[in-house]
């Protein structure tokens, strides 16, 4: 039996990571021991799972790593990897400083809102995650058809504003569609704006007919596809 030890301490020499906002940060604590140790991460001394972080985090236990994409000022802090087994434990601290960029148009997380397929009568949630230096505002738009056309004479799509909201820069904005029908199918756009400009991302909602209960035991309410 052997207490945990660092297998590549030379890869851990860079203690302070000062990165511009919007960049990706990767912390690694490669270790070994017998029995094989587990790794946990703390932020400023508290257990860290990234649930309150826009974009979340990626924990790759086989690589002993923590990855955070599109870092923002609220990600600043001390990140501790805690490696332990039945014999003992070791820890290492990384310091993260996020250098604020110039104020920019809102950045929308890639892949959101996501293309979604749902069954008639089910409920759907479309998500939009926004990163913005300035306080952003959001609109949800549905692309509509007028007189058989999706576009006006000016070349711009016809849209209907479904929801307008001011949000905090780290919030996830959700559009709830209850009891969807075939008419709800189509293209939806999340528009985020701030004092610099607007940014858009779109997704398609496909609505399938109600499934026959005689041949399906339990259909999921909504299936999400990228």
């Amino acid at each position: 039996q052997q207490a945990p030890y660092w297998t590549h301490p030379q890869r851990m020499e860079k203690k302070l990571h000062a990165v511009p906002a919007g960049n990706t940060v990767k912390f690694r604590c490669p270790a070994a021991g017998n029995p094989t140790p587990t790794i946990r991460w703390l932020k400023d001394g508290q257990a860290f799972h990234g649930e309150n972080r826009i974009g979340g985090i990626r924990l790759r236990h086989q690589h002993w790593s923590l990855v955070m994409e599109s870092v923002v000022p609220s990600d600043r802090g001390t990140y501790t990897c805690l490696v332990e087994n039945a014999v003992g434990s070791i820890r290492y601290n990384y310091l993260l400083d996020v250098l604020e960029r110039s104020p920019h148009r809102p950045i929308l997380q890639a892949g959101l809102p996501a293309n979604t397929t749902a069954v008639v009568g089910s409920d759907v949630e479309l998500l939009c995650k926004v990163y913005s230096d300035a306080q952003p505002h959001i609109q949800w738009l549905k692309h509509i058809v007028i007189n058989g056309s999706s576009f006006g004479a000016d070349g711009f799509p016809y849209v209907q504003v479904l929801k307008t909201a001011d949000i905090n820069s780290s919030e996830v904005e959700v559009l709830y569609l209850r009891n969807v029908s075939a008419e709800d199918a189509g293209e939806y756009t999340c528009l985020a704006g701030n004092s610099i400009g607007l940014s858009y991302q779109s997704a398609w909602l496909t609505v399938l007919p109600e499934e026959d209960p005689t041949w399906t035991a339990a259909a999921p309410e909504a299936r999400y596809t990228d």
């Epitope: 738009l141 006006g152 307008t164 704006g193 701030n194 004092s195 610099i196 400009g197 607007l198 858009y200």
Partner: antibody, heavy 124, light 112 residues
Amino acid sequence: EVQLLESGGGVVQPGRSLRLSCAASGFTFSSYAMHWVRQAPGKGLEWVAVISYDGSNKYYADSVKGRFTISRDNSKNTLSLQMNSLRVEDTAIYYCVRGAGRGYTRGPDGFDIWGQGTMVTVSS
Amino acid sequence: DIVMTQTPLSLSVTPGQPASISCTSSRSLLHSDGKTYVYWYVQKSGQPPQLLIYELSNRFSGVPDRFSGSGSRTDFTLKISRVEAEDVGVYYCMQYVEAPLTFGGGTKVEIK
């Protein structure tokens, strides 16, 4: 007709102050961010400052930070630029420019409407 | 800050001939939403700048179709397919991604 009309320019000595105004008409002023851009005589364009639609966010060029203050009065459809500690290099035509709106627009999201400009001369 | 570099400084064109102005940005202007936020303006003598092209290649309303914008990420071009006498002025590119918004130094277009 969408219009922006600047006023308040003039000749002022270095170190003194001046307040520029921009009167907006023909659009919902309170729904748009607004910018100031300046142009020194015979030179190019330089962005000066922006203010969000509700006045909660303001950003400035480094060259004017701490000396200029952008503000707005949505009840009067007016944008202002308070210029303190003026320097000779602040001599320029100052343009008021409409920025991004609060929502979907069928066209560019700002920097489409410019005022005629007001001349500020800083000279001893 | 994003630096916008414009070439040439000046351009003398025969009416009816094409003209091309280049603009290079120090960083990519391709935003996360897939749009490229470069704008083109013309400033005629004694007037404020007038918008010609927005979001890389979209002509602003009322702009003649002899004006076109193209490019990608950091390299952009404004083309006038057939220059007319009224096209005389100084042309500017601008990045509209982040503050401070920055402009190219300008290209003066004259008629031969």
